[in-house]
């Protein structure tokens, strides 16, 4: 994200009366983790538990339907991206616990954080793709009937993954392990060194393609979808509005700190006080962004429960209703009453 993505305690406590035992790898000031790091660890732990279980369940539910149901393709890809992101969390967790020391080697430094980034961007871009699909379903139903197929859905997913890969390449190329002399510590991060312009370019492209564009897509698509469904009394639902607002708002809220700090740090000198302050908040911003990886299954379940009236079905059954039903008027992660009624009938018939 930044010039060199790490934080450590400051070592400004030396004076003639205070000479440390310097046999220990890290000095006594670093025995306690910073508050932002503690918060990040808590978030990582929760996201890992909810994300792994929730997304694994979504993958299991959608995998069987993905060959014939387009919605299942969307949610399968989204869940795979989120699931893979969550699997990398123990690595980040371990590093933060060790005061950002990276004991996993150079290859792991290049690959693991880059994989995390790949999966996180894939989930964002897939979300944007899904919203575009919902938009077309509502406003171009005839076109959808003719051209909207599983093949096209898989191509769209491949494009999303490809773009995510492109966004990740700079991070992979510039990622290095640095062993600091004192206090002895190995750090993993991106180092643009001589290329501040490229660092800024990467940050701007990442902001636009990985945040502003998907956000714009989500906002425009869902605004139009809401206006259309709102204008038809039969499909009006405050729950629909709430779910749609939840999708867009969660995306915006959880990614905003990461993107804002990222763009700011690319324009700041690494030795400046603002940079150092933002660097201390880096783990917290990353953990905040990671909430996106576990929020989707929660929204699905809440949406499914809300519209079923009460939880009469098992969780997999509920998720199957929410994720795999094909309809022409249903928005991504938002379900009108009429649609859910149809889904319930079809599920009972299976």
């Amino acid at each position: 994200m930044n010039s060199f993505n790490y934080t450590t305690p400051d070592y400004g406590h030396y004076d003639d009366k205070d000479t440390l035992d310097l046999n220990t790898p890290v000095d006594k000031t670093s025995n306690t983790l910073r508050v932002p790091d503690i918060l990040a660890l808590v978030i990582f732990a929760v996201v890992f538990l909810v994300g792994v279980l929730g997304n694994a369940l979504v993958v299991w539910v959608t995998a069987f339907e993905a060959k014939r149901t387009i919605n299942a393709i969307w949610f399968l890809n989204l869940a795979v991206a989120d699931f893979l992101s969550c699997l990398a969390l123990p690595i980040l967790f371990t590093s933060i616990v060790q005061h950002h020391h990276w004991p996993f080697g150079g290859a792991a430094c290049s690959i693991l954080p880059s994989l995390i980034l790949l999966n996180m961007y894939a989930s964002i871009l897939l979300l944007a793709t899904i919203s575009a699909d919902r938009f077309l379903l509502v406003f171009k139903p005839i076109w959808c009937q003719n051209f909207r197929g599983a093949g096209l859905a898989w191509i769209a997913c491949a494009v999303a993954w490809g773009l995510a890969l492109l966004l990740t390449i700079p991070s992979f190329l510039y990622r290095v392990v640095r062993e600091e002399y004192f206090p002895p510590k190995v750090l993993c991060g991106v180092d643009y060194s001589h290329d501040k312009r490229r660092e800024r370019a990467v940050a701007i492209v990442r902001l636009v393609l990985g945040f502003l564009w998907p956000l714009l897509t989500l906002t425009i698509c869902y605004t139009f979808i809401l206006l259309r469904t709102w204008s038809r009394r039969a499909t009006r639902s405050t729950k629909t509005l709430k779910v749609v607002v939840a999708v867009v708002a969660s995306f915006f809220i959880f990614w905003l700190p990461y993107q804002v700090t990222g763009i700011m740090m690319s324009f700041l000198e690494p030795s400046s006080p603002t940079f150092l302050l933002l660097n201390k908040l880096d783990s917290l911003c990353v953990s905040f962004a990671y909430i996106n990886c576990c929020i989707n299954p929660i929204i699905y379940v809440v949406a499914g429960q809300g519209f079923q009236g009460r939880l009469r079905k098992s969780l997999p059954s509920l998720l199957r209703n929410v994720l795999t039903e094909e309809s022409v008027v249903r928005e991504s992660k938002s379900f009108t009453r009429s649609t859910v009624d149809t889904m319930a009938q079809k599920t009972q018939a299976v």
């Epitope: 010039s3 070592y11 000479t19 310097l22 046999n23 002399y181 006080p273």
Partner: antibody, heavy 125, light 112 residues
């Protein structure tokens, strides 16, 4: 005042070992790390490693990991570097240099404030 | 390893002239604590190196104020405002941010 007095010039044969010394005075020996630096004509300065005399913790440049052994004798306030399996490439001037731990905010043992006068090692058959 | 590239290799000057030596590192020398551990040493003929400047721009005790250091990240400069006879020798830049600690190849300051 602070002094780092190094042992005299050494002449050794290839394959042999030598032990260079750096006797300190004028400061508390255990409060400062001692570094060793190699200088060959036309090849600049090379960092070998350091020892923390208070607990004999050492850190080496990987390049010298199997070449140099760093030790310290707290009773005589002397640091030692033993060079083993000598080759012609080991012919150089070797310096000991100390690093301060007490120069104010944001500082640690980062720069060499005092150097020894150097020991010339000649490896020749 | 961090490669320290010094320019020029040789710098012939006249007494009272200004002199400038450049040092560039292959990686950023900004430590995770925000400090930059780039130092300058002078090795006079037949002597051991002496510290001139530490942490980019801080003069060591006893160093005349005609010596000044500047720079950030990867690019650093040592300036001598009015060269005196005692300034002759080899100037080394050195980094102690990352392991292994490394030195520049040296710049030989000599009188014309």
């Amino acid at each position: 005042q602070v002094q780092l007095q190094q042992s005299g010039a050494e002449l050794a044969k290839p394959g042999a070992s030598v032990k260079l010394s750096c006797k300190t005075s004028g400061y508390t020996f255990t409060n400062y790390w001692m570094h060793w630096i190699k200088q060959r004509p036309g090849l600049g300065l090379e960092w070998i490693g350091y020892i923390n005399p208070s607990g004999d913790y050492t850190k080496h440049n990987q390049k010298f990991k199997d070449k140099a052994t760093l030790t310290a004798d707290r009773s005589s306030s002397t640091a030692y570097m033993q060079l083993s399996s000598l080759t012609y490439e080991d012919s150089a001037v070797y310096y000991c240099a100390r690093v301060p731990l007490s120069y104010g905010s944001g500082n640690g043992p980062y720069y060499f404030d005092y150097w020894g006068q150097g020991t010339t090692l000649t490896v020749s058959s | 390893d961090v490669v320290m590239t010094q320019t020029p290799l040789s710098l012939p000057v006249s007494l009272g002239d200004h002199a400038s030596i450049s040092c560039r590192s292959s990686q950023s020398l900004v430590h995770s604590n925000g400090n930059t551990y780039l130092h300058w040493y002078l090795q006079r003929p037949g002597q051991s190196p002496k510290l001139l400047i530490h942490k980019v721009s801080n003069r060591f005790s006893g160093v005349p104020d005609r010596f000044s250091g500047s720079g950030s990240g990867t690019d650093f400069t040592l300036k001598i405002s009015r060269v005196e006879a005692e300034d002759v020798g080899i100037y080394f830049c050195s980094q102690s941010t990352l392991v292994p600690l490394t030195f520049g190849s040296g710049t030989k300051l000599e009188l014309k």
